[in-house]
């Protein structure tokens, strides 16, 4: 066993910064600031749009705003996945895409965002107040889920603005409690900074970190407001539940999907990332491969401390479909 990628730790401010403000007052804002800066990320956004052309057709777009790389995306409706929600699509970078009616086409838009078009007719069609949820699994940080629905007043063809994490369900114990503490901390930090601003500036001993003080003031409000968005999503709409799809006829596909405990499988769209036309599966297995770097001979961005990953703007190389479907 080995750990391939290490997440760079935030460096704490250096010790020995006791000035006229005193140790407690100076260190606390830095601790809180560190917490506030990290509390707001990562985040998931969900955008639900009703198509003007087909009034009962929906497009759901979801994205992950975070530094981690996505290794599984699950889209569900009627509530969060695993909490009464019904899976519509599962997207895996290597093994491909699987979807169930009324999902018409799921696809990767970028390496960290997906879109899903829903069919609009029949008993299983969505209605305007249906809740759609997207869950992004990022390794090894955990999974984050956000839910969204069309605003009651929205006109066809208009989309609800992206909802940044109405539900942030990190699979870490006590995340909500911690978020509450962090939110309080961020507010307290703001209060401290405001109070500090109205006070005559104390003379600090020379310090390498003092130039960062203005940045602290600039960061805090945005992060605090971001943290405020991370509230538990309580009102799951169940007035418009999808019909059971047990009568659907499976059409083969990759065997790894065979026993998913959702409804009977419709024909899988082969991983159609960055492609509008779905690629049908051939034979009993779908051959999929992780599409990594766009140019042959291009060196990969190795994961490691302090590394920023820059995805190729064109996404994975299109070999028989971007993920290698044959």
């Amino acid at each position: 066993m080995r750990t391939e990628a290490q997440v760079p730790a935030l460096q704490p401010p250096e010790p020995g910064l006791e000035g006229a403000m005193g140790h407690r007052t100076l260190v606390l804002p830095w601790v809180l600031l560190t917490l506030c800066v990290t509390a707001g990320t990562p985040e998931v956004w969900v955008q639900v749009r009703m198509e003007a052309t087909e009034l009962s057709s929906f497009t759901i777009r979801c994205g992950f705003l975070g530094s981690g790389s996505i290794s599984l995306v699950t889209v569900s409706w009627g509530g969060p996945n695993g909490a009464g929600g019904t899976t519509l699509a599962v997207l895996h970078p290597e093994r491909g895409i699987r979807q169930w009616a009324p999902a018409r086409q799921a696809r990767w838009e970028t390496q960290s965002s997906i879109s899903l078009i829903l069919e609009g007719s029949g008993a299983s069609s969505p209605c305007a107040n249906t809740t759609f949820c997207c869950k992004f699994a990022s390794f090894p940080e955990g999974s984050w889920e956000a839910c969204g629905s069309l605003p009651p007043s929205s006109d066809p063809g208009l989309s609800a603005p992206p909802t940044p994490a109405p539900i942030l369900r990190a699979d870490l114990a006590g995340i909500l409690g911690v978020s509450g503490v962090l939110l309080f901390g961020c507010v307290y930090l703001l209060h401290l900074l405001r109070r500090h601003k109205h006070r005559p500036a104390p003379r600090l001993q020379p310090s390498r970190t003092s130039p960062q003080a203005p940045r602290a003031r600039a960061w805090a409000p945005s992060q605090a407001s971001q943290a405020a968005l991370h509230v538990p999503y309580a009102t799951i709409n169940t007035s418009c539940r999808p019909a059971t799809l047990d009568t659907a006829h499976p059409h083969g596909g990759p065997s790894w999907w065979a026993s998913l405990p959702t409804h009977a499988a419709h024909r899988p769209q082969g991983p159609a990332a960055w492609a509008s036309t779905p690629i049908p599966a051939r034979g009993s297995f779908v051959s999929v491969e992780n599409g990594l770097y766009a140019q042959a001979g291009e060196r990969p961005p190795h994961t490691g401390p302090g590394l920023t990953l820059f995805p190729d703007p064109r996404g994975p190389r299109a070999m028989e479909g971007p993920l290698g479907v044959r």
Epitope: T3, S69, S143, P300
Partner: antibody, heavy 120, light 106 residues
Framework: QVQLQQSGAELMTPGSSVKLSCKAT????????IEWVKKRPGHGLEWIGE????????NYNEKFKDKATFTADTSSNTTYMQLSSLTSEDSAVYYC?????????????WGQGTSVTVSS | QIVLTQSPAIMSASPGEKVTITCSAS?????MHWFQQKPGTSPKLWIY???NLASGVPVRFSGSGSGTSYSLTISRMEAEDAATYYC?????????FGGGTKLEIK
């Protein structure tokens, strides 16, 4: 820290069954495939199959379809592989492995292996 | 299923020597991955997606190839490189490994 902890060595008799375990820690167990690999002395690596615990989805190498059965217990973050009707051909070290695939990279995490000896 | 044939099965090389291990697939694959295994230890991912070095792998290693023909190369053999190397395809189920190449130091 991501870790896969496998159960201890097993000495079995021909015809019996054995259930190997692989306990995962350090990541969201339900969202990642656990693969099983066989290594016999003097032979190469063989891919047995895989399971996605959160979806109870399995995929087997046809060669091992009647030999291996994968299960998962999400409450204990443990994946199991049961090997049935054991013969001397099943004497091997069995590894559970997590290979994480994203658009950017592969990462691998291996259990320490469980040695199974089938002998009368 | 796709059969991967590695050659040579066993080879020895002197320190500083260039080493090339090949892996031939029975049908075309998109990428090839390579694993290193030393006696008594679990295998380790060594090269992924044909040419990308896994974390911690020395830069003297490289991988190349396409279609049905792939190779792993060590520009200058070192004692710590003595191990068994396996190629693996993940383009078509079931995933398969090559038979392995045991690399020894002279």
């Amino acid at each position: 820290q991501v870790q896969l902890q496998q159960s201890g060595a097993e000495l079995m008799t021909p015809g019996s069954s054995v259930k190997l375990s692989c306990k995962a820690t350090g990541y969201t167990f339900t969202d990642y495939w656990i693969e099983w690999v066989k290594k016999r002395p003097g032979h190469g690596l063989e891919w047995i199959g895989e399971i996605l615990p959160g979806y109870i989805s399995t995929n087997y190498n046809e060669k091992f379809k009647d030999k291996a059965t994968f299960t998962a217990d999400t409450s204990s973050n443990t994946t199991y592989m049961q090997l049935s009707s054991l013969t001397s051909e099943d004497s091997a070290v069995y590894y559970c492995v997590l290979i994480v695939t994203t658009y950017y990279y592969f990462m691998d995490y291996w259990g320490q292996g469980t040695s199974v000896t089938v002998s009368s | 299923q796709i059969v991967l044939t590695q050659s040579p099965a066993i080879m020895s090389a002197s320190p500083g020597e260039k080493v090339t291990i090949t892996c031939s697939a029975s049908s075309s694959v998109t990428y090839m991955h390579w694993f290193q295994q030393k006696p008594g230890t679990s295998p380790k991912l060594w090269i992924y997606s044909t040419s990308n070095l896994a974390s911690g792998v020395p830069v003297r290693f490289s991988g190349s190839g396409s279609g049905t023909s792939y190779s792993l190369t060590i520009s200058r053999m070192e004692a710590e490189d003595a191990a068994t190397y396996y190629c693996q395809q993940r383009s078509s189920y079931p995933w398969t490994f090559g038979g392995g190449t045991k690399l020894e130091i002279k």
